[in-house]
């Protein structure tokens, strides 16, 4: 085993230097210190190392710092954070603004996401602010890492930061992400008016509660079916016949093609069917006439 | 301030060998990595080889194995390179440089190869 | 065997910008950030400018400055000057044989 070879006499390197490419990798993990590497990161990315000779000096940096690399290390760390694991990330603890964005333009279109996205996460855990500069230095990766953020680092992220959020950024958000993020692009939002607020917060929908989208069916928006179907199941049954038809507006038609889906199925179903017969869409599923919905949240209750 | 100075211009005939020495001064020499770089007239830089004078073995472009040696004196910091069975291609100035970034070249060795 | 390709020349006029472009593959230059530049002026020795794809030596004017995109590396020189006319190297570390690959060259002319 590599470890347990002692480094050969006259090889023990007391700085990074050059000769060290021409090592062998047991004679890298016997004689390189992590306390020497951490101290010339500089050297360790100027000198042409291999991959396997970069990975031999982590597990050096690694088992040098157990708990995380200190900050001081990760300031110096330049091209070398590209070997280094979002899981690695998930340890650290960053709290200077320069050190993400120099780490993050390192990382800039070298399939890097995972990396970039924790390193953000870490410092905004760390009482970080997400600035406009750190989300532009995130580049193009798209704000979808936003739903990986615990609830509480959401709370770090400026409402300006919601402008740049587009559609797909969204999918994969829990419902307790959603509600913070339509929350913050409602402040973000607040001056501005009309179909450009609609257009601006439907991307947030996903978010709003019943009273919000009650709010919302009194502006003639004519939301497309595919906001809709992005809307939350709890806030969306809350609605009647007449608040959806105002809310979709010309787009009412297309409930037809969604009737047995998910969330417009779990809507159709709280509705008393002579409603639905009224709007002359042939939409079924409804409560029979005559029946009395008595809902205790039994399903709730044992789920 | 680190200097490299190269040995001085060479005619040789088809053959022969030349020997091209290249003494460092100004810094650590053992450490350090050397490389030879040649460029033949009108042509761009070409790697021929290079050595870590701590460790004595070099290493050469596939193009010049077997014609090329590479030594160095470290008690002189000078580094040196062989180039034998010399052929009219082989006309060239040759350059030795310090470091793999090359920071710091020697000033050229014309060799000039010709019956 | 690793190829790096330049342009055989570019131009510009005094005060322009401009860039040069040295393109490998994913695994010398787009794989690791060893690019360096050099500037050979005519009977001259190479002068290291950019090393590491942005770093710059003591020395070496802050007009010119190194980049990488992908498999791309690119010297681009600001505020043309006419004694920037010279031959630009782009050069890497192949692993393979532990040594130096230059591109094939850039000649620079500064019209005027």
């Known amino acids: 085993d590599a470890e347990q070879k002692a480094c050969p006499p006259g090889k023990e390197p007391y700085k990074v230097d050059e000769d060290l490419i021409f090592y062998q990798n047991w004679e890298l993990e016997a004689c390189v210190d992590g306390t020497m590497l951490a101290r010339q990161m500089d050297l360790v990315n100027e000198i042409p190392f291999t991959y396997e000779q970069l990975s031999i000096f982590k597990h050096k940096l690694d088992k040098t710092y157990p708990q995380g690399y200190p900050e001081s290390l990760i300031q110096q760390l330049g091209h070398f954070f590209r070997y280094v694991s979002p899981e690695d990330i998930h340890q650290w603890n960053v709290t200077s603004p320069d050190t993400v964005k120099t780490l993050l333009k390192v990382s800039k279109g070298q399939k890097m996401n995972a990396q970039a996205i924790a390193l953000v996460a870490c410092y905004l855990r760390g009482g970080g602010q997400l600035d406009e500069d750190m989300v532009k230095a995130l580049g193009d990766i798209p704000l979808s890492y936003l739903c990986d953020f615990s609830p509480q680092d959401l709370h770090s992220v400026p409402s300006s930061v919601m402008w740049l959020v587009g559609p797909q950024d969204l999918d994969k958000c829990s419902q307790r992400h959603l509600g913070l993020l339509y929350q913050k692009a409602c402040s973000a939002f607040q001056n501005v008016s009309g179909l450009e607020y609609f257009e601006k917060i439907k991307t947030f929908l996903g978010g709003a509660s019943v009273k919000d989208l009650r709010a919302l069916s009194q502006h003639n928006v004519s939301m497309d079916i595919a906001t809709f179907k992005r809307l939350q199941v709890d806030s969306l049954v809350g609605l009647s016949v007449a608040e959806v038809q105002k809310l979709l507006g010309p787009n009412i038609v297309d409930l037809k093609t969604e009737e047995d889906k998910s969330p417009v199925r779990d809507w159709l179903f709280r509705q008393h069917q002579k409603d639905l017969d009224r709007l002359g869409l042939g939409l079924q599923g409804g409560i029979p006439n005559g029946y009395l919905v008595l809902d205790f949240n039994v399903r709730e209750a044992f789920s | 301030q680190v200097q490299l100075v190269q040995s001085g211009a060479e005619v040789k005939k088809p053959g022969s060998s030349v020997k091209v020495s290249c003494k460092a001064s100004g810094g650590t020499f053992s450490s350090y990595y050397f490389s030879w770089v040649r460029q033949a007239p009108g042509q761009g830089l070409e790697w021929m080889g290079g050595?870590?004078?701590?460790?004595?073995?070099?290493n050469y472009a596939q193009k010049f194995q077997g014609r090329v040696t590479i030594t160095a004196d470290e008690s002189t910091s000078t580094a040196y390179m062989e180039l034998s069975s010399l052929r009219s291609e082989d006309t060239a100035v040759y350059y030795c440089?310090?470091?793999?970034?090359?920071?710091?070249w020697g000033q050229g060795t014309l060799v000039t190869v010709s019956s | 065997d690793i190829a790096l390709t330049q342009p055989a020349s570019v131009s510009g006029s005094p005060g322009q910008s401009i860039t040069i472009s040295c393109t490998g593959t994913s695994s010398d230059v787009g794989g690791y950030n060893y690019v360096s530049w050099y500037q050979q002026h005519p009977g001259k020795a190479p002068k290291l400018m950019i090393y590491s794809v942005s770093k710059r030596p003591s020395g070496v004017s802050n007009r010119f400055s190194g980049s990488k995109s992908g498999n791309t590396a690119s010297l681009t020189i600001s505020g043309l000057q006419a004694e920037d006319e010279a031959d630009y190297y782009c050069?890497?570390?192949?692993?393979?044989?532990?040594?130096?690959?230059f591109g094939g060259g850039t000649k620079l002319t500064v019209l005027g």
């Open positions: 440089a310090r470091r793999t970034s090359m920071d710091y």
């Open positions: 050069a890497t570390w192949d692993h393979s044989q532990m040594g130096k690959v």
């Open positions: 050595i870590i004078p701590k460790f004595g073995s070099a």
